[in-house]
């Protein structure tokens, strides 16, 4: 009897491994061995393909053949008993556009509020991704434990630190690599779980801006309590990508170590031209806080992008805000030209309920006050460059108080 | 102004120890590696190790672990390279040079090391 | 370990005449951690390039890094008498950071 020849072949590859699976075309014929030869491109003659000769199962691996996984290569199987069906051919294939991503490897940190993830390729050292390694990017699916309620972070890089979480909690997480230049998304990783630790008992600090003031910069942070020190660090922004590179290193400030006040000032050529990530510790002589939310800092924008100043008309149910360009030190203003997006916040002195208006005129109307009260409002620019996408940091509060209830017209 | 001072030229008999040194000043000396780089005379460069002064992270190249130890005292800024039991091999200029994501944007001026019976 | 080759290993040109340096490397690296300096004798090493492509501060633009994954190129447009020297490729990518063999340019 004829043997048939072996159909519907099947090409996985999941990273640098290349997995064959096929169908029997003959289930009622017992002892039946497959074997595969494999070309390359531009040439004539066929190779017997190691790792999958004679074999008994309707799977195999030839992951250890040495391919240039950007070279076209064709596969061919057969049947053998006593003798052997026809080939049957399988369309050619590139091994680099056929390949999926793996699962990449992920280990957590837990902090009270916070969970760093740190993720590598799931293959180390991959020949498939070999000149792509860098490009990886990553997305993640992160939820409570106890309500299963998913939030999907995007565009993530091998070091990763998720904020405001819950101490004592249960969060689980799962993480698939992608690379967007060649338009692949992997496979998720195993959910892994962390718990959160105790509610440290000094919290990191909040609210870190930078501003320009003559040839120096200013860094401010809020803080909940009085008497501490503060230290603060700095690292190349593009290092986030590389974080296993022996550089990937915080450094030391050394006008903004050991400081007792929330701001520090330090000179504007300790940074050359770049985008930095700047993070600040507190500590009472005893206990150390976390570190805080990162702050990304690009000395081109920070130089240029400075808070909007405005004057305010106060009416009995409204401000008129009239936005004017910032000034530089000596009081002259700053010339931008650039398109800028004005975000005016404001709220009653009273309580620390704020709201928030978007515009992009220089004269805003805030609607709806109350008469005879006081209101603060701060205020920031962003750049409608999408490329660009900075924002200054916000004015000083200016708080003012509206008319009695007749002056609205 | 970013200055690395090298330690002076040494002649050495083979089996004896040496430590030579390499000060740094003008810059942020726990901010930044620190470099040992190994040129035989008329040979090419050759990375021995890294040292981070800031937290002491030490890292050998393959072919250097193991026949030198690499050290720093940030309190008076200065780094270290030195031999237990040195062999005629060891004979060569030896640099030291600060290390950060420009390369090794800084070099001091070497120092002569010859291990001659 | 990563291995840089360079190539090639003596290039013999006249001043004004386009050098063209190569180094290779075993395994991809980051153009991010490649750097080129040059030596000349009895001196320490000067850094050119870092970056792949970046111009480390009074290097002038004569000189122009390219390149990425494997391949990278050191080129200098109109070779100048100072230009004479011993060339070295490196990379940091790894911490067990490795300098190319050098390429020699000589005056022809």
């Known amino acids: 009897k004829n043997l048939k020849s072996p159909q519907k072949v099947e090409v996985d590859i999941i990273d640098d491994n290349f997995i064959l699976r096929w169908n029997r075309s003959d289930e009622s014929v017992g002892n039946v061995t497959f074997s595969f030869d494999y070309q390359k491109t531009g040439m004539d003659n066929w190779i017997k393909l190691s790792g999958c000769q004679n074999i008994t199962s309707t799977k195999c691996n030839f992951s250890s053949l040495k391919l240039n996984v950007y070279e076209e290569i064709k596969l061919r199987i057969r049947a053998e008993k006593e003798n052997t069906s026809s080939w049957y051919e399988v369309d050619s294939f590139t091994p680099f556009r056929k390949a999926q991503i793996g699962p990449p490897e992920v280990h957590l940190e837990a902090e009270d509020k916070a969970i760093v993830i740190h993720i590598s390729p799931g293959t180390k050292d991959s020949v498939m991704w070999a000149l792509d390694g860098l490009s990886f990017t990553y997305s993640l699916v992160i939820w409570k434990n106890s309500s299963g309620v998913e939030e999907r972070i995007e565009n993530i890089y091998s070091r990763h630190k998720i904020y405001k979480l819950s101490p004592e909690t249960t969060y689980c997480l799962k993480v698939k690599a992608a690379l967007l230049t060649s338009w692949k998304i992997g496979v998720y990783s195993p959910v892994h779980c962390i718990k959160t630790t105790v509610e440290n008992e000094l919290p990191p600090p909040e609210n870190i801006e930078v501003s320009v003031q003559n040839q120096n910069y200013v860094l401010k942070w809020d803080y909940t309590y009085a008497n501490m020190t503060f230290q603060v660090q700095w690292l190349h922004a593009f290092l986030k990508r590389n974080p296993g590179n022996h550089l990937y290193k915080w450094k030391q400030i050394p006008d903004c170590e050991n400081v007792k006040t929330t701001q520090c000032v330090f000179p504007q050529n300790v940074f050359q031209k770049g985008i930095y990530l700047l993070r600040v510790q507190a500590s009472d002589g005893n206990n150390t806080s976390f570190w805080s939310e990162e702050i990304k800092f690009d000395t081109e924008i920070q130089a240029f992008l400075l808070p909007p100043v405005f004057n305010i008309r106060s009416l009995s149910d409204s401000f008129h805000i009239y936005i004017g360009a910032p000034k530089q030190s000596g009081n002259t203003p700053v010339i931008q030209d650039y398109p800028l997006i004005y975000e005016i916040i404001f709220w009653e002195n009273t309580s620390n309920a704020e709201r928030k208006i978007i515009e992009k005129k220089t004269d805003v109307t805030v609607p709806n006050l109350k008469p005879l009260t006081v209101y603060c409002v701060k205020a920031r620019a962003h750049t409608m460059d999408e490329k660009l996408n900075k924002s200054s940091v916000f004015s000083d509060a200016v708080c003012e108080k509206t008319k009695p209830g007749n002056t609205s017209k | 102004e970013v200055q690395l001072v090298q330690s002076g030229a040494e002649v050495k008999k083979p089996g004896e120890s040496l430590k030579i040194s390499c000060k740094g000043s003008?810059?942020?000396?726990?901010?930044?590696?620190i470099a040992w780089v190994r040129q035989v005379p008329g040979k090419g460069l050759e990375s021995m190790g890294i040292?981070?002064?800031?937290?002491?992270?030490?890292r050998y190249s393959p072919s250097f672990q193991g026949q030198v130890t690499i050290s720093a005292d940030k309190s008076i800024t200065t780094a270290y390279l030195q031999w237990s039991s040195l062999k005629a091999s060891d004979t060569a200029i030896y640099y030291c040079?600060?290390?950060?994501?420009?390369?090794?944007?800084?070099w001091g001026r070497g120092t002569l090391v010859t291990v001659s019976s | 370990e990563i291995v840089l080759t360079q190539s090639p290993g003596t290039l013999s040109l006249s001043p004004g005449e386009r050098a063209t340096l190569s180094c290779r490397a075993s395994?991809?690296?980051?153009?991010?951690?490649l750097a080129w300096y040059q030596q000349k004798p009895g001196q320490a090493p000067r850094l050119l390039i870092y970056?792949?492509?970046s111009r480390a501060t009074g290097i002038p633009d004569r000189l122009s890094g390219s390149g990425s994954g494997t391949d990278f190129t050191l080129t200098i447009t109109r070779l100048e008498p100072e230009d004479f020297a011993v060339y070295y490729c490196?990379?940091?990518?790894?911490?067990?950071?490795?300098f190319g063999g050098g390429t020699k340019v000589e005056i022809k």
């Open positions: 490196q990379q940091y990518d790894s911490s067990a950071i490795t």
């Open positions: 395994q991809s690296v980051s153009s991010s951690f």
């Open positions: 040292i981070y002064p800031g937290d002491s992270d030490i």
């Open positions: 970056g792949a492509s």
């Open positions: 003008g810059y942020i000396f726990t901010n930044y590696w």
């Open positions: 040079a600060r290390h950060d994501i420009e390369g090794f944007d800084y």
